[in-house]
């Protein structure tokens, strides 16, 4: 970058290299050129001649004014004409950055998915920062007392195999930058009470020919939970508003659900699951597409037909044996 | 283009004080090097300090180390030399010259500087 | 301190003739020398600069050359304008220091 280039002499930011979006700020370029009085210093930034706000302080200092900084990165470099050079000398060179202190994360979330030997924990970050952000991720047994921390720059997947500590622990998270430091609520959380069944797949759909034409669809998860809590969720391509069911099930085997839908309509389903009574549903499944025939011919839609392009992060609680229409869109 | 105007003739006792001064135009003080020669009558130019902007210093040499003050007033582009305790064989003409690519381009007219009792 | 010689000390020469001085230094100064024109009563006037660049409106019967701590001044064509002393002066280090000057008369 800029800051690797040789330098003669020096340049500052004030009041930091790393500063607050919207602030005022002073660049200083001081000269240090042998046999070279500078006539002139000039600032770049981003390779264009800066024109306006240059004062100059001494006679090899000079600085540059900013009111109102809004860029996340911008490259500095200023150069000084010295007499009898037939071009620009270059002094020196920084690479500025503005941004924002980070938001208390909150919102932590942390899940096993089933087989995946991990616990994955999220949390909303807040507002962008624009510039480097960490986050530690706090991890203390409430029972041994024992207190791990994982550095990352989003989320963070702990082996199941590290947490030695029992079942029950405080996890939080801390986020720090050149700006601040802000740290979570602590979350409590019981690993048996975080496991999110291994997803659950549309796998085809077929209409049956009957007096009321049917619509099966097939769908499997290879959970070895037993009791699990499932939502089917369908509309019509053309509408806003799923329609959604629910099944307790259980996955020895395949499961096929019923739908009596109107003919000759595009349709599209997803599905979902949790353990029965746990907190997590797993994200809705892949969008699985189905379109129900004109009139009387069997119609069967494999699951290598459907759309992949949007697994959708969702959840809908509703309760349990009723058929619902859900417009709320995808919620966490 | 830069120039240089120096003040007039001084005569002065021995053990006094001698101050020259050296207005500059064309270019503000702010970015220029302003040095010092003297030259004795019938001898060699001598350096006798300047403003160093590799390192952003005033630098006297060492004859006249403790004994000479170089000032500037950016208000007026005026430059200033002052030599104290003056001897008989400070007798000289004193120049301003301005630092360019490591030579002094632009002279003022000189100074003559008599000291005498 | 960086001392400065010049060789020689004087010389005589004719209109048209070529004229060299020289000028040594008792430690390396890469290219930062400058070479002087003084007229009696009159300021020094700098005629090169960085050991081998003509200052400009100097005529070009003027050139400098040498690097390290050997440089040379030549005037090729000597014009009765050319009398008077010339010096070398180094600017690689702390304090600049002047050669004692070649004193240059017309025959």
């Known amino acids: 970058g800029i800051t690797n280039i040789n330098c003669s002499g020096h340049i500052w930011v004030e009041p930091a290299t790393i500063f607050k979006m919207g602030m005022n700020i002073s660049i200083y370029c001081q000269a240090a050129i042998k046999n070279c009085q500078p006539r002139k210093l000039h600032f770049y930034k981003n390779g264009i001649k800066e024109r306006f706000q240059i004062t100059r302080i001494n006679k090899t200092t000079a600085r540059l004014w900013y009111k109102n900084f809004l860029e996340p990165h911008a490259s500095m470099y200023c150069t000084a004409e010295c007499p009898k050079h037939f071009q620009e000398t270059l002094i020196c060179g920084k690479d500025i950055s503005s941004g924002y202190p980070p938001d208390i994360p909150d919102e932590v979330t942390c899940v096993i998915y089933e087989y995946s030997g991990n616990m994955t924990c999220t949390w909303n970050a807040g507002k962008l920062t624009y510039i480097d952000t960490k986050y530690v991720v706090h991890v203390k047994s409430l029972e041994t007392e024992e207190e791990q921390q994982y550095l990352t720059s989003s989320y963070i997947n702990i082996s199941t195999d590290s947490l030695q500590g029992g079942k029950k622990y405080l996890v939080w998270v801390q986020a720090a930058n050149a700006l601040g430091m802000e740290e979570s609520k602590q979350l409590q959380i019981h690993l048996d009470d975080i496991v999110i069944p291994s997803a659950a797949v549309i796998s085809r759909a077929e209409t049956i020919n009957a007096t009321v034409p049917k619509t099966i669809i097939y769908w499997d998860s290879q959970t070895t939970i037993e009791k699990v809590s499932c939502e089917m969720r369908y509309k019509a391509t053309t509408n806003q508003t799923w329609n959604v069911k629910e099944f307790d099930t259980n996955f020895t085997y395949v499961q096929q659900s019923e739908f009596y839908l109107e003919p000759n309509i595009k349709y599209v389903f997803q599905v979902r699951c949790q353990e029965t009574g746990k907190r997590y549903w797993q994200p809705w499944s892949s969008l699985f597409f189905h379109k129900t025939p004109e009139t009387v011919p069997q119609v069967t839609s494999k699951a290598f037909q459907h759309d992949t392009w949007n697994s959708g992060l969702t959840v809908a609680s509703i309760s349990t044996g009723h058929l619902t229409s859900d417009n709320r869109g995808d919620i966490g | 283009q830069v120039q240089v105007v120096q003040s007039g003739a001084e005569v002065k006792k021995p053990g006094a004080s001698v101050k020259v001064s050296c207005k500059v135009s064309g270019y503000t003080l702010i970015e220029l090097a302003i040095h010092w020669v003297r030259q004795v009558p019938g001898k060699g130019l001598e350096w006798m300090g300047g403003f160093d902007p590799e390192h952003g210093e005033t630098i006297y040499a060492q004859k006249f180390q403790g004994r000479v003050t170089m000032t500037e007033d950016t208000s007026t582009d005026t430059a200033y030399m002052e030599l104290n305790n003056l001897r008989s064989e400070d007798t000289a003409v004193y120049y301003c010259?301005?630092?360019?690519?490591?030579?002094?381009?632009?002279w003022g007219q000189g100074t003559l500087v008599t000291v005498s009792s | 301190d960086i001392q400065m010689t010049q060789s020689p000390s004087s010389v005589s020469a004719s209109v048209g003739d070529r004229v060299t001085i020289t000028c040594r230094a008792s430690q390396g100064i890469s290219n930062w020398l400058a070479w002087y024109q003084q007229k009696p009563g009159k300021a020094p006037k700098v005629l090169i600069y960085?050991?081998?660049s003509l200052q400009s409106g100097v005529p070009s019967r003027f050139s400098g050359s040498g690097s390290g701590t050997d440089f040379t001044l030549t005037v090729s064509g000597l014009q009765p304008e050319d009398f008077g002393t010339y010096y070398c002066q180094q600017a690689n280090s702390f304090p600049f220091t002047f050669g004692p000057g070649t004193k240059v008369d017309i025959k």
């Open positions: 960085t050991a081998s």
């Open positions: 010259a301005i630092l360019e690519a490591g030579d002094l381009d632009c």
